[in-house]
Structures are given as structure tokens and as C-alpha cells.
């Protein structure tokens, strides 16, 4: 129930002491290193790890990717799986843990020694000459945004939406992914079922923009076979 959710959070996630500062949003506060709020653990363990159902990598955590749990299993059932470490087999970048990427079916390091050239073999665009390193906490696919240095414009190759400029998302286009515009009000959108059927999409659409959601178009004049058309509509 909602109450149990809220009560559990009231225990686990306590804000800083109120002390009257709340009326002054200009000041910032953060958890000091080593301070744990009741029930909170800054260094989250995965002892109680529960596989989470997903439809795409972006629904998973930064150390996970979305796939069928069994090799050759039902493509309709996907969960978030732990990312693959260096030298493990992979089929796409998202399968590799942060600081790595998928090259020739193997997860390899994306540190500055290997970084240049290797990725440019897999992404055929020029992204400048600066040699950036990846910090250990970055999302594995911020590897691409750190490589590009400027956010990808429409049509740029990307790995994740965070690689793309504001107003764009990273979506499949044939067998690669490119930055495409986030959908505006009235534009046709794809309402994904939880089973992850859109993994088969060749031309993936972006999600709806801020303040919009993908809902069935309530147009009674449409033919019955197109009555399932979804468009981006105001909340």
C-alpha cells in the first residue's frame, strides 16, 4: 500500500535536520561522507538484489543492462541483468560495465590509453582530439558524451540519451542509434508494453517531451484498425 511505502521511506530516507533553513533554497546541503541516514547505506550492497523487469537499458541501473535472462529465451520477458566486466562477451555497449565498451564482442576498457581509435572504429565520426578519462562513477555510456565533448546534435551517433543535446533522445535507427527529437504535443508516439516488444523496432521513436505523456488518441472518426494510435498529450 501507499502508506507502507511512505512509512518505509520515512524511516530510510530522512532529510537533513530542519533548523529553519528550508525557507532559503539558495543554500545547499549534502550527506557528508560516512554519514548514513537511518536505514540508508551510501555504499549500496546487492545482497537483497531483486531482478527488475525492463523494456530497455535505460530503465535499468547504471551497472545493468536489459535482456532476456536465459540465452535464446523468450524475448518478451526481459529483466535488468548485471553488467559484464572487462574481457567478458558482449553484443552491445550497454552490456559492459562503466568504464568499458563492447568491441568485437568483448568488453574492453575505455581508459585513455585504448580510448582513441578503438571507439572510432565502431563509431565512424570525428569527435575532436581531447583525451578525456572516465571517472569511475559515470554511467557507462557517458563514455560517449565524454568522447564527443559536445552533446550530439540530431542525427549524431549515440549510445544513450545523455549523449544527445537537450531536446533530443538516443533512439534506434536501423542497427545503430542516433539522436532524434523528443516528441512534441500531437506527434505519434509508441506506447511500449512492459514485455519489451519494442526491442524489435528498427526505427525507434523518442519519448514525449516534458509535460506530455503517450496516450491513446481519442478520435472516434478513425477507422477501427487505427484506433490504437497513440499521441503525445498534455497531462
Amino acid at each position: 500500500t501507499l502508506n507502507s511505502v511512505l512509512n518505509s521511506n520515512a524511516i530510510k530516507n530522512l532529510p537533513p535536520p530542519l533548523g529553519g533553513a528550508a525557507g532559503h533554497p539558495g543554500s545547499a546541503v549534502s550527506a557528508a561522507p560516512g554519514i548514513l541516514y537511518p536505514g540508508g547505506n551510501k555504499y549500496q550492497t546487492i545482497d537483497n538484489y531483486q531482478p527488475y523487469p525492463c523494456a530497455e537499458d535505460e530503465e535499468c541501473g547504471t551497472d545493468e543492462y536489459c535482456a532476456s535472462p536465459t540465452r535464446g529465451g523468450d524475448a518478451g520477458v526481459q529483466i535488468c541483468l548485471a553488467c559484464r566486466k572487462r574481457r567478458k562477451r558482449c553484443m552491445r555497449h550497454a552490456m559492459c560495465c562503466p568504464g568499458n565498451y563492447c568491441k568485437n564482442g568483448i568488453c574492453v576498457s575505455s581508459d585513455q590509453n585504448h580510448f582513441r581509435g578503438e571507439i572510432e572504429e565502431t563509431i565512424t565520426e570525428s569527435f575532436g582530439n581531447d583525451h578525456s578519462t572516465l571517472d569511475g562513477y559515470s554511467r557507462r555510456t557517458t563514455l560517449s558524451s565524454k568522447m564527443y565533448h559536445t552533446k550530439g546534435q540530431e542525427g549524431s551517433v549515440c549510445l544513450r540519451s545523455s549523449d544527445c543535446a537537450s531536446g533530443l533522445c538516443c533512439a534506434r535507427h536501423f542497427w545503430s542509434k542516433i539522436c532524434k527529437p523528443v516528441l512534441k504535443e500531437g506527434q505519434v508516439c509508441t506506447k511500449h508494453r512492459r514485455k519489451g516488444s519494442h526491442g524489435l523496432e528498427i526505427f525507434q521513436r523518442c519519448y514525449c517531451g516534458e509535460g506530455l505523456s503517450c496516450r491513446i488518441q481519442k478520435d472516434h472518426h478513425q477507422a477501427s484498425n487505427s484506433s490504437r494510435l497513440h499521441t503525445c498529450q498534455r497531462h
Epitope: 511505502v5 511512505l6 518505509s8 521511506n9 530510510k12 530516507n13 532529510p15 549534502s30 550527506a31 548514513l36 541516514y37 536505514g39 540508508g40 547505506n41 551510501k42 549500496q44 546487492i46 538484489y49 531483486q50 527488475y52 525492463c54 530497455e56 535505460e58 530503465e59 535499468c60 541501473g61 547504471t62 551497472d63 545493468e64 535488468c80 562503466p98 571517472d135 562513477y137 559515470s138 554511467r139 557517458t142 544513450r160 540519451s161 545523455s162 519519448y207
Partner: nanobody
Framework: EVQLVESGGGLVQAGGSLNLSCTAS????????VGWFRQAPGKEHEFVTG????????YYADSVKGRFTISRDNAKNTAYLQMHSLKPEDTAVYYC??????????????????WGQGTQVTVSS
Amino acid sequence: EVQLVESGGGLVQAGGSLNLSCTASGSAFSSSVVGWFRQAPGKEHEFVTGINWSGARTYYADSVKGRFTISRDNAKNTAYLQMHSLKPEDTAVYYCASGRDRYARDLSEYEYVWWGQGTQVTVSS
């Protein structure tokens, strides 16, 4: 380490709207979950809404569903909370919080370890 600063709070009449922002400093924001919590006078703080690192997943408490919208722009290190059709019972101090999003779970179940100072939202009848 992530530092969070909320803005956009204020006084509004019932039925009105407010837009809160939560701006983060620190490189970890784009790989962090973000949640909005609130605490009304004399009440326990409650989880209002959350969004995962990519924006692909969101969660809303029943009390705000259909009225509040959470979003984020990782390029700007900012999360947003659009609040419409506000009610007097929405009056509270609103906190933005974040935590590492390494392993997916229900957005109400994350450990939110970094907190903003809070911004006051007052809805008058």
C-alpha cells in the same frame, strides 16, 4: 559527492501551479536517481515522486498522480517538478534528493543520500 539546490517554491492559490527545480553540482548527477520528498508541519516526510538516471522510469505517490510531473535534463544537471492543480494539503517543505542508481528497483526504495536544503511551498485556500 552531489550538492543539490532547490528553487521555485512560493505562495500560490489553490488550483494554481508551481515549477520546482533541483540543480546539482558534481559529476555523479547523470548516473543518479532523483526523488522529491515533502514534509508538512507536524507530519512525517513523504516520498512524492522519483525518476531514474535516464528519465525512462518515473513513480508518483497516489496523492499527486495526474497533477505533478517529474522530469530531468542531465545536460543541465537539473531535475524538475511541475505541480498543477495545487491543493492546500500540498503545503510543505519540498526536498530534492538523489542517490546512486546502480541497480534498478522501485523508485520509492532507493537510498537517497544527498539532500537539498528544501524549498517552501504554501497553497492558500
